[in-house]
Amino acid sequence: DGCKDIFMKNEILSASQPFAFNCTFPPITSGEVSVTWYKNSSKIPVSKIIQSRIHQDETWILFLPMEWGDSGVYQCVIKGRDSCHRIHVNLTVFEKHWCDTSIGGLPNLSDEYKQILHLGKDDSLTCHLHFPKSCVLGPIKWYKDCNEIKGERFTVLETRLLVSNVSAEDRGNYACQAILTHSGKQYEVLNGITVSITERAGYGGSVPKIIYPKNHSIEVQLGTTLIVDCNVTDTKDNTNLRCWRVNNTLVDDYYDESKRIREGVETHVSFREHNLYTVNITFLEVKMEDYGLPFMCHAGVSTAYIILQLPAPDFRAY
């Protein structure tokens, strides 16, 4: 059929709750393309009728809710003027084990998500909720071991649960829950998170060293594509996260819709004493709004930025 297979994504999901997957693969999906979803190599596209339990919503496939029989491989076909690409998504649906309904009806949580809190620090957990904008998400509630979390040490901040002065007792099984409303119907979304505690000082016990960038500006022409590497050295056993942010937001979140600026896949080279990590940021097309804005590379507690600036005019041309 002339379509190029890009990659296979595996997702393990809970039955009886909503699920959505967005078909994006920059730079392919950043241009003028059409996106069509299919199930199990069927020639018939997934319905676009919003009343259908499974339907395509713009570039998303949306299950309202997921059911046992929905397991299988789904294909997303991305067609451009002169190209065709295909992403395969392997969905496996399982039944969650629930708490005794007499004590609140929350799940006996699996290790579906794993997150770490840092002992003695102020830290946070994230509720991963990925749905199209047609889905209105109600306030997020947080639970630990099936009991709703309350108390002075906890603050719900958007999709985060802030935890101040993390203690060993904070390890355990958490869940975040929200009511999703779509076309007047309500569904419960509930994600399980297994939380462990690390005793490392700071975020990982070492201060990572950012080799590049070095808090400097880069001259780049308007409209060009730009890729900048962030190179970081860190200890071999570190648990530090490395990422690019703009306006205090992960670039992939900040440019969630347009995908114009994306973080690359992290790679690393292992040396005897340390690891060298590289994570890039790609500007598919530099726009005026990018100039003068600090794009920050974060590695644990270390940060460094680049600022894009227009090249100085070449007066020799006049």
């Epitope: 901040l157 958007e158 101040s164 205090n248 819709e257």
Partner: antibody, heavy 117, light 107 residues
Framework: QVQFQESGPGLVKPSQTLSLTCTVS?????????WNWIRQPPGKGLEWIGY???????NYNPSLKSRVTISRDTSKNQFSLKLSSVTAADTAVYFC??????????WGQGTLVTVSS | DIQMTQSPSSLSASVGDRVTITCRAS??????LNWYQQKPGKAPKLLIY???RLHSGVPSRFSPSGSGTDYTFTISSLQPEDIATYYC?????????FGGGTKVEIK
């Protein structure tokens, strides 16, 4: 719970520097997020002034950039605003707030600063 | 700067009425749109973030929608405690900017 308390003089003379401090409890300002100043002149709308992030980098509204400095004292879990060369147009209620990935999620109760001789 | 234009600037409605406020951005803000409620003499409170997500403790009668440059905020059944000024705010591009506000009153 994350909470804020703004403090500073309620009256500042024209041409002087306005100085305010925001004391944060319930979360370390060096752990994450951006810590913001926002103002609201009496009977008017809201204007974002600037932020200092958890890593210490700052960003200011271009309309005020030449006059604004935001700094922090991590030992006291405080961040501060200095606005120089004030005029009557700077009379406003000044709020501090935490910005999550998307929004100004929690705010202090605000403090009124009047610029008058 | 991105200009945020809110309408109407004020409205008067009866308890139980459906109330809609609109917010238009001067350019596409990719759903980075938040709504706040401010009562006299108080700080603004976050109601909705990222176009369609309700903040902690916000009742379901507050209903958001929109995309691109146009966003709406609906109170399905106005309650006496909803009397306030409502602001939209874009978080897409620095400097972050607010709409001029919509004052909601009871008839």
């Amino acid at each position: 719970q994350v909470q804020f308390q703004e403090s500073g003089p309620g009256l500042v003379k024209p041409s002087q520097t306005l100085s305010l401090t925001c004391t944060v409890s319930g979360y370390s300002i060096t752990s994450d997020f951006a810590w913001n100043w926002i103002r609201q002149p009496p009977g008017k709308g809201l204007e974002w002034i600037g932020y200092i992030s958890y890593s210490g980098d700052t960003n200011y509204n271009p309309s005020l950039k030449s006059r604004v400095t935001i700094s922090r004292d991590t030992s006291k879990n405080q961040f501060s605003l200095k606005l120089s060369s004030v005029t009557a147009a700077d009379t406003a209620v000044y709020f501090c707030a935490i910005r999550g990935p998307y929004s100004f999620t929690y705010w202090g109760q605000g403090t009124l600063v009047t610029v008058s001789s | 700067d991105i200009q945020m234009t809110q309408s109407p600037s004020s409205l008067s409605a009866s308890v139980g009425d459906r109330v809609t406020i609109t917010c238009r951005a001067s350019q596409d803000i990719n759903n980075y749109l938040n709504w706040y409620q401010q009562k006299p003499g108080k700080a603004p409170k976050l109601l909705i973030y990222y176009t369609s997500r309700l903040h902690s403790g916000v009742p379901s009668r507050f209903s958001p929608s929109g995309s691109g440059t146009d966003y709406t905020f609906t109170i399905s059944s106005l309650q006496p405690e909803d009397i306030a000024t409502y602001y939209c705010q874009q978080g897409h591009t620095l400097p972050w900017t607010f709409g001029g506000g919509t004052k909601v009153e009871i008839k």
